[in-house]
Interface confidence: medium
């Protein structure tokens, strides 16, 4: 057997909506043929399930094998360290992989202009991999939240935040011209799960948008 | 998951200085907002500074010119020294943090920081 090797330092997962990925940290002095095995465990079913055999990254997606992560009472995941006919021992996620570990986001964000508002439709994620009938709306049915940050360009500051209990929302610009741009970050009230802000959707404002009424 | 846990909180006379610091454990962002928040008894929580990943700083109106963050990033520790402290600067002070891509500009405005420590006890008498 020779020396034993040391088994991969952390092991984590790192998921959005039907995004569920687990990484590793890499054993140090790994030779070039040093390659990890992973397993996954279902809570209720107490056996491991080998998922693969020699993975030569330092991650995994996961999500076809946890399509039911948002039914279910989560999974633990662990990873070894191969090379040739060595093995290290397995290093098992510290925490229960759970529908509170993903990470939530949007799938964009769309603005028009409408008399001086900024109306912004926030489109919720639709990921290929989720089954027809889990959709984002469904599994978070209730108290779906999203933080708006409004930024004024030029200028690098965020001028407003505010919170909204919708996916439809208006942003008053007090009568402002120029360049707006916005970000949104979602949350569900009645959950832990930590939310990625989306990327920044920009509109610029001309006084032609503006009515004047008496 | 990141933790954050503060220190240096206390009691002194107006006038007086502390300084607060607040670890964070198993965090290994390059991009983040950080920054220290207050709530007095029966007030809302309020931003009092806050940090970008850039070294960029701001700071609530209340605090600026008596205030200063800072970050010490080979220890993954953020600061607060607070100068000329007042009565009314008498609250908890709690330590956030907004880790990830594409978060808009860091602003003590930010609702939305995802880490919250427990919190520690600042109390300024006259």
């Known amino acids: 057997h020779g020396t034993e090797l040391p088994s991969p330092p952390s092991v984590w997962f790192e998921a959005e909506f039907f995004h569920h990925i687990l990484h590793w940290t890499p054993i140090p002095n790994q030779s070039e043929s040093t390659c990890y095995e992973v397993a996954l465990l279902r809570y209720g079913i107490e056996s491991w399930n080998s998922i693969s055999n020699c993975s030569q990254t330092l991650s995994y997606d996961l999500t076809a094998v946890t399509l039911d992560l948002y039914h279910s009472n989560g999974y633990r995941a662990r990873v070894r360290a191969v090379d040739g006919s060595r093995h290290s021992n397995w290093t098992v996620t510290n925490t229960r992989f759970s529908v509170d570990e993903v990470t939530l986001t949007v799938g964009s964000v769309n603005l028009e202009i409408h008399n001086g508002f900024i109306l912004g439709k926030i489109q919720l994620p639709r990921p290929k991999m989720a089954p027809a009938n889990d959709t984002y709306e469904s599994i978070f049915s209730h108290f779906r939240e999203y933080e708006i940050a409004i930024r004024k360009v030029p200028g690098n500051f965020t001028f407003t935040h505010k919170k909204v209990k919708h996916e439809n929302f208006s942003l008053l610009t007090s009568g402002e011209v120029g360049e707006f741009c916005v970000q949104v970050k979602p949350s569900v009230a009645s959950r832990s799960n930590k939310g990625m802000w989306s990327k920044e959707e920009c509109i610029s404002l001309t006084r032609q948008y503006f009515t004047v009424t008496n | 998951q990141v933790q954050l846990q503060e220190s240096g909180g206390g009691s002194v006379q107006a006038g007086g200085s502390l300084r607060l610091s607040c670890g964070a454990s198993?965090?290994?962002?390059?991009?983040?907002?950080m920054g220290w928040f207050r709530q007095a008894p029966g007030k809302e929580r309020e931003g009092v500074a806050v940090?970008?990943?850039?070294?960029?700083?701001s700071y609530a109106d209340s605090v600026k010119g008596r205030f200063t963050i800072s970050k010490d990033n080979g220890k993954n520790t953020l600061y607060l020294q607070m100068n000329s402290l007042k009565p009314e600067d008498t609250a908890m002070y709690y330590c956030?943090?907004?880790?990830?891509?594409?978060?808009?500009?860091?602003?003590?405005?930010?609702?939305?920081?995802?880490?919250w420590g427990k919190g520690t006890q600042v109390t300024v008498s006259s």
């Open positions: 956030a943090a907004d880790l990830g891509h594409y978060r808009p500009p860091c602003g003590v405005l930010y609702l939305g920081m995802d880490y």
């Open positions: 198993r965090y290994t962002y390059s991009s983040y907002c």
């Open positions: 940090i970008d990943s850039d070294g960029s700083t």
